[in-house]
Interface confidence: low
Amino acid sequence: SGVFQLQLQEFINERGVLASGRPCEPGCRTFFRVCLKHFQAVVSPGPCTFGTVSTPVLGTNSFAVRDDSSGGGRNPLQLPFNFTWPGTFSLIIEAWHAPGDDLRPEALPPDALISKIAIQGSLAVGQNWLLDEQTSTLTRLRYSYRVICSDNYYGDNCSRLCKKRNDHFGHYVCQPDGNLSCLPGWTGEYCQQPICLSGCHEQNGYCSKPAECLCRPGWQGRLCNECIPHNGCRHGTCSTPWQCTCDEGWGGLFCDQDLNYCTHHSPCKNGATCSNSGQRSYTCTCRPGYTGVDCELELSECDSNPCRNGGSCKDQEDGYHCLCPPGYYGLHCEHSTLSCADSPCFNGGSCRERNQGANYACECPPNFTGSNCEKKVDRCTSNPCANGGQCLNRGPSRMCRCRPGFTGTYCELHVSDCARNPCAHGGTCHDLENGLMCTCPAGFSGRRCEVRTSIDACASSPCFNRATCYTDLSTDTFVCNCPYGFVGSRCEFPVGLPPSFPW
């Protein structure tokens, strides 16, 4: 990088005329356009590949140009370049007449040109000015030029850059000879490579700044020595990245199927015994005196309706006591002093004599029970609904309203989405609370194992630079574990110029 400097010194246009020979009115208000470009044996139009610069109006007809700012323009004129100076150049200097204040090319008539000079040749970098003078029939231009290096550039071609910096492109200061000296924590030819946190795993970690430890895909922890389980893994661990090895009592591809509800949730109350009966399913066996799906309800001794023949039950500290209606006696009012002649059967019950009329029995119509058909049948008393189903009396019958996931007259059947064998190609079906999941055999994928895939994503050796390849069996994709000094999804990038990582 450097600057081509052009010092305009004197312009002579004694007759005050344009290139066409036409005189300027009132005089030639002269400004210059400069085009610097690559060497051409014959200088021709085309891009000013090294740069362009224009001056303001510097004078009228003939004038000398001062060595400092003049009307807002600089002298010498600066044409900076940001490449290695090739040592050769072409230079076009045009003198133009400005009738008005607008100096833009499109604002000037094409015949406003006063003169045009074009030179080409060799030019070495240096402090010394080359003086030149170009004369045409009507004008003369005296000028000098040179090429110097920009600050922080050195060498015959201004190609040796050394500028202290502390950014993405390097972290160094410059030595007197232009060589680099790395800042603490940085290494490498251009001091771009950070020295990572001590102990950072050399395969699984890397860093973008000193004393840092960033983990490659599949690894975590302060030193990147802990693997990351598969995305979605709930109750599982890994020994290499993207595994999901289930903890005790859990199952399924993501270890999210509870195979031990009893242990994990202890749902049975009041000392009941819990038995696992499938995924998220259990049965509580209640101790005497308790009832309910989770044995959460304490039974009253009267709850079992021990008093017969319309006797009323009273709870007592040491048990219960039956108050018998007229005509009955006994602990449970089970003995009668009545006969069929006393019409003891209620609610349309039929009376049948027994023991030669000393006793009787009532035959009750549907929906009634008891020795005298005095009780309306409550078909829910015996808690016939399994798996937490709710019992409902419906006239002469009862029905069970089942919890989600259960069916059958008594909610005794677990609803199975797997019953219709939805998993293709020998996939294993798992019932979930809200549906099902297929675990596919090797070589198949998709929600129902319907997609045939390659069995081993690593078979094609997709990883570069001797990286280790892991196959993610749940998605049939691969993960590359890069050796030290390489990054990227396939370990294709050297760490020296880290790309922007997608993780």
């Epitope: 139009p45 891009p47 590949t49 362009t52 490449f83 499109e106 094409p110």
Partner: antibody, heavy 119, light 108 residues
Framework: QVQLVQSGPEVKKPGASVKVSCKAS????????ISWIRQTPGQGLEWMGW????????DYAQKFQDRITMTTDTSSTTAYMELRSLRSDDTAVYYC????????????WGQGTLVTVSS | EIVLTQSPGTLSLSPGDRATLSCRAS???????LAWYQQKPGQAPRLLIY???NRATGIPDRFTGSGSGTDFTLTISRLEPEDFAVYFC?????????FGQGTKVEIK
Amino acid sequence: QVQLVQSGPEVKKPGASVKVSCKASGYTFTYYGISWIRQTPGQGLEWMGWISAYDGNTDYAQKFQDRITMTTDTSSTTAYMELRSLRSDDTAVYYCARYSWNKHWFDPWGQGTLVTVSS
Amino acid sequence: EIVLTQSPGTLSLSPGDRATLSCRASQSVTGSYLAWYQQKPGQAPRLLIYGASNRATGIPDRFTGSGSGTDFTLTISRLEPEDFAVYFCQQSAFSPWTFGQGTKVEIK
């Protein structure tokens, strides 16, 4: 909008000349140059040269230097490209495209003119 | 003359895929002088990218140009059906101005 409209297809015999026109509209014609590019199945896209509508200066590719002439008519905002001593390998679609010295690209392009050279 | 070599010659991809086209110059080219064009059958080329990385007016932001020196890249982040075409790079730093031989992006 900026538009370049070219003349129609031409069929020529070897040794003849062809002159293709390119009518510009939608911008100040003299602020830009016109480049000519041809496309042959064998050679792909090939730049032939350009002309400044501002001052008429031209820059021809050396390959065509001795048999090409580019001109402009600022009054009708039209550019012309004449190619002489035609050969069969000059069969191509010839495009004009707007170009400016400080914008180093071609935009827009004309629709193209097919020139067929055949005996 | 500067030779621009484009690779690959043909790219077979599906809609939604990412396309990466390369243009390598036989010698260093200032980025300001490198452009990319798209051409569909029976049509003139259309400017996509100028100055190596600037999108032309009306060009969607899925088109990105990058690079400097001798290596330049055109990236199409997600291919749309209308993007299947031939793409050319072009330099105007040194005369004669030259084009690459083109990369055809076709539907797989």
